[in-house]
Interface confidence: medium
């Protein structure tokens, strides 16, 4: 049995994450009327390297057979939405590309790729840019998120 919970994530500037097209997440500020456009994640607690401050999770989109995954594209670690077989996912032993180390710092969360250590789910300061995998090496990109629970 894999344990999951449903949640929404916002970046440190309170930008929400929305699905753009079929396979891309973007971060933007939403007003009250269109807050329902935010994606709801199904966060599953999976096997991986565990410590008290790093918890392995997989991030699926609720109601869709899509999971965030980390792959090498053009010699660079890249975040993508990957379609999966709904009869087999989520599972405890998720392939490493689907696994993120959830790191809690006070009330903020970071999501480090298990496949590519020190690369994090990131958003740009700029509105309506894709969510991506960044290595936060001195740049302006945002890697901290807040989590809001959603009733299952």
């Amino acid at each position: 049995a894999v344990r999951s919970l449903h949640c929404r994530l916002q970046d440190a500037q309170q930008k929400s994450l929305v699905l753009s097209g079929t396979y891309e997440l973007k971060a933007l500020h939403l007003n009250a009327e269109n807050l329902n456009q935010q994606v709801v994640f199904s966060m599953s607690f999976v096997q991986g390297e565990e410590s008290n401050d790093k918890i392995p999770v997989a991030l699926g989109l609720r109601g869709k057979n899509l999971y965030l995954s980390c792959v090498m594209k053009d010699d660079k670690p890249t975040l993508q939405l990957e379609s999966v077989d709904p009869n087999r996912y989520p599972k405890k032993k998720m392939e490493k590309r689907f696994v993120f180390n959830k790191i809690e710092i006070k009330d903020k969360l970071e999501f480090e790729s298990a496949q590519f250590p020190n690369w994090y789910i990131s958003t740009s300061q700029t509105e309506y840019m894709p969510v991506f995998l960044g290595n936060n090496s001195g740049g302006q990109d945002l890697i901290d998120f807040s989590m809001e629970f959603v009733s299952s």
Partner: antibody, heavy 120, light 107 residues
């Protein structure tokens, strides 16, 4: 530090109900599962069920469905377990516990226990 | 339900002795296993979760291991304060189930 403080001992008549509370401090209440466990006199431990206060997700042991009702109040950081239609075999110490390190990593902290005695 | 068969049910050991308690799971529990210590009239105290991770403040003489579906708790050098009842717990599948307990007494 993390603390779980439970309500005091109760003596109830058969057929009555009782509501045990578990007040949590020292961590973000909404984020971690609260477990309920019972221990009959001289016996081992038995898992009743759990709740994730942040969204009200509840999982019960089938054996306790209809007997135990688990709730949580995030405004007071308190979890509750109500036991209904009490019988003498419900006499036990009831514990709350929390999976503090995260959702699947083990019961880490425990309340002091609440003794519920069912006696005519 | 997953059955956790714990052995021995009781044992005597001498101070300084190495002590091992085992739990056998009736099916695969993916290493989702904790160990607890309980003293008379007290709440259980969590020693280990996820087979071998020690809870903060638990002495390093306690350790956990697994071999297939057999899980072990070892106390490397028994101390007087270690006497009590020890329980294992699987929390892989609902309903979570505890072992029957091992009463450890000082010889």
């Amino acid at each position: 530090q993390v603390q779980l403080v439970q309500s005091g001992a109760e003596v109830k008549k058969p057929g009555a109900s009782v509501k045990v509370s578990c007040k949590v401090s020292g961590y973000t209440f909404s984020r971690y599962w609260i477990e309920w466990v019972r221990q009959a006199p001289g016996k081992g431990l038995e898992w009743i069920g759990e709740i994730l206060p942040g969204n009200g997700n509840i999982n019960y042991n089938e054996k306790f469905k209809g007997k135990a009702t688990i709730t949580a109040d995030t405004s007071t950081d308190t979890a509750y377990m109500e036991l209904s239609s009490l019988r003498s075999e419900d006499t036990a110490v009831y514990y709350c516990s929390t999976i503090y390190y995260d959702y699947d990593q083990g019961f880490t902290y425990w309340g002091q226990g609440t003794l519920v005695t069912v006696s005519a | 339900d997953i059955k956790m068969t714990q052995s021995p049910s009781s044992m005597y050991a001498s101070l300084g002795e190495r002590v091992t308690i085992t739990c056998k799971a009736s099916q695969d529990i993916d290493r989702y296993l904790s160990w607890f210590q309980q003293k008379p009239g007290k709440s259980p105290k969590t020693l280990i979760y996820r087979v071998k991770r020690l809870v903060d403040g638990v002495p390093s003489r306690f350790s956990g291991s697994a071999s297939g579906q057999d899980y072990s708790l070892t106390i490397s050098s028994l101390q007087y304060e270690d006497m009590g009842i020890y329980y294992c717990l699987q929390y892989d599948e609902f309903p979570y189930t505890f072992g029957g307990g091992t009463k450890l007494e000082i010889k």
